[in-house]
């Protein structure tokens, strides 16, 4: 049903869903701090633009009695329950920030008349693609898929002269929310990734993964998995690995690889890590000092959600346009705004664009080094290290199928 919005007469409210079930196990207090820091910045920016208005956030908490798993598995109805609560209290703001779980976002989008914008720190799944009033501020699965297909096809770099068309995907069901949906997208038979590959098999058991590492009859040399180095070590340990195996470790929200004193463990030598380019000032920022690298990105997405709202509010107010209109609800896309840590670009469907970074372990220095970067906005690869000190033969990535000749 239509809910009146607290969104006029110089007073603009943001509804922030503080859900018990969240994409990342982040204390709600930290998210509140991120939102409040964002509000301070927005107020300053509006004031500097000569706009004398009030911007506040209302934090809507779930009672946590029914939906208490803490992860996203029981989030489907929690979002709707919170919306009902907002509806009953007649307290809808101009914009809704949260939820972060794909299940809840999908359900909320499906079951409500969305005449207001929804900003999510998460909602990674393909089912949340192409939603007209949904903006996602953490890289969704679709972006990962486009990178992987682009990289698989690449055969014109001195370190990658074979096009790949095969892959194993390791997915054992214990993944974090982001990894769950990333791997889910790769597994889906109708996805772009599956469509572009000739062979793809999902490995669900640890033993399956371990056996592939030395199996002479394996159908692909490439294995995609999602998580951090520790996750890989638990699975792989110090087992021998065939020389032409390439493990692609998707670990987008982890800037530890870029810290100066980090040395890559030996078990990472056959691994290419896909992560996001780290922010410039985040490591020392006030709101992120107590956060782990993953949680920094999650809290940052909440903060940037506030800044995005401020950006749109400023534009509409300067143009003398109404905020409580479908036009406003549909405007949170195809734009670049000044985020907490520099410009943030949203694509035509409101999904954040980013620079993905592919790292390798240098056999010389035992350090993580940047192999290439990939701009998701233009789907373009930028090679960085043209002569990487790989573990693989001839400093080239191997063919994806053992014994297949040059291409």
């Amino acid at each position: 049903s239509q809910v009146s919005q607290n969104c006029h007469n110089g007073s603009y409210e943001i509804s922030v869903l503080m859900m018990g079930n969240s994409a990342f196990a982040e204390p709600l207090k930290n998210l509140e701090d991120a939102v409040n820091e964002g509000l301070e910045i927005v107020r300053g920016r509006l004031q500097n633009a000569g706009l004398n208005v009030t911007v506040n956030a209302t934090f809507m908490y779930s009672d946590g009695l029914i939906h208490n798993s803490g992860d996203c598995r029981s989030s489907t109805c929690e979002g709707l329950d919170l919306l009902r609560k907002i509806s009953n209290a007649q307290r809808m703001g101009c914009v809704l920030i949260g939820p972060s779980c794909t299940y809840s976002t999908f359900q909320m989008y499906l079951d409500t008349e969305l005449s207001y914008p929804m900003i999510s720190a998460g909602s990674f799944g393909l089912s949340c693609d192409y939603k007209e009033t949904l903006t996602r501020l953490m890289s969704p699965a679709r972006k990962l898929m486009y990178f992987l297909v682009n990289f698989w096809k690449t055969n014109d770099l001195p370190f990658k002269t074979y096009s790949w068309s095969t892959s194993y995907v390791y997915k054992n069901g214990t993944e974090t929310e982001d990894c769950f949906w990333y791997l889910n997208a790769l597994e889906a038979s109708v996805s772009y990734f599956s469509h572009e590959l000739g062979f793809k098999v999902v490995l669900r058991q640890d033993k399956e993964f371990q056996d592939i590492l030395m199996d002479h009859n394996r159908k692909s040399n490439v294995i995609i998995m999602c998580g951090g180095p520790e996750f890989l070590y638990k699975l792989k340990g110090d087992r021998a690995v065939a020389e032409d195996i390439v493990i692609i470790l998707v670990d987008l929200f982890n800037d530890q690889y870029f810290e100066d004193n980090v040395t890559a463990p030996d078990y990472m030598k056959n691994v290419l890590v896909l992560t996001l380019s780290p922010g410039n000032s985040l490591l020392n920022s006030s709101f992120s000092r107590n956060l782990s690298p993953t949680k920094r990105d999650f809290a940052l997405a909440y903060l940037n959600g506030i800044l995005l709202f401020g950006h749109m509010l400023k534009i509409f107010l300067e143009n003398g346009e109404n905020i409580t209109t479908p036009k406003f609800a549909h405007a949170f896309r195809n734009l670049t705004f000044e985020g907490y840590d520099g410009p943030v670009t949203l694509d035509d469907w409101g999904d954040v664009d980013s620079t993905m970074v592919l790292l390798y372990t240098s056999v010389d220095t035992k350090k993580y080094k940047v192999l290439l970067t990939y701009d998701t906005h233009v789907n373009k690869t930028y090679p960085v290290d043209m002569s990487p000190t790989f573990t693989w033969k001839n400093s080239k990535l191997p063919n994806d199928i053992t014994g297949r000749g040059p291409q």
Epitope: D156, P158, F159, K369, T381, Y382, V384, M386, S387, P406
Partner: antibody, heavy 118, light 106 residues
Amino acid sequence: EVQLVQSGAEVKKPGASVKVSCKASGYTFTDHNMNWVKQAPGQRLEWMGVMNPKFGTINYNQKFKDKATITRDTSASTAYMELSSLRSEDTAVYYCARDNYPNYFDYWGQGTTVTVSS
Amino acid sequence: DIQLTQSPSFLSASPGDRVTITCSASSSVNYMYWYQQKPGSSPKSWIYRTSNLAQGVPSRFSGSGSGTEYTLTISSLQPEDFATYYCQQYHDYPPTFGGGTKVEIK
């Protein structure tokens, strides 16, 4: 419009060093690798090395590893190549060339002539 | 290093002629790149990834080939096409150039 403007011609004595600059404009300097290429009189083009301005990664052609040192100043959008212990065979035109993968070397500087003569 | 051998080294032709330049690689490469250079000027990107014309290159130019043999073809030579053409590979590190083919007016 993309432009790579190199420093002027240099005449050096054997044993000396020379530093050639290449100022980039018309694009984001840190987005693209910068290559250096040598063209000695009557010789084929020779690739010397490449630098990624964003991460500072440098790859040298083994042949020029002890001859050339590539650096950059990102704030000035400028790449540099220093040639040391100059000899007569270092007499050549040196070019910087932007890498715009998949079109390698898509824009070239106008070249800097280095003459080594006693 | 991969060696690139261009043939011919010199080529005399008249405007309107069809001209073919060949580049042979000492081992197989996936793609070939071509550059045009005029006297006193720096090289210009001409053809990349074997057959893609660089920006501003006329459609009378074409590139083809695979493995170790690649060609640049000018379907109808124009006065402004008289220059030296170089092939280049980046399949293996380091990238290497051919010795050049000088196209002169007959």
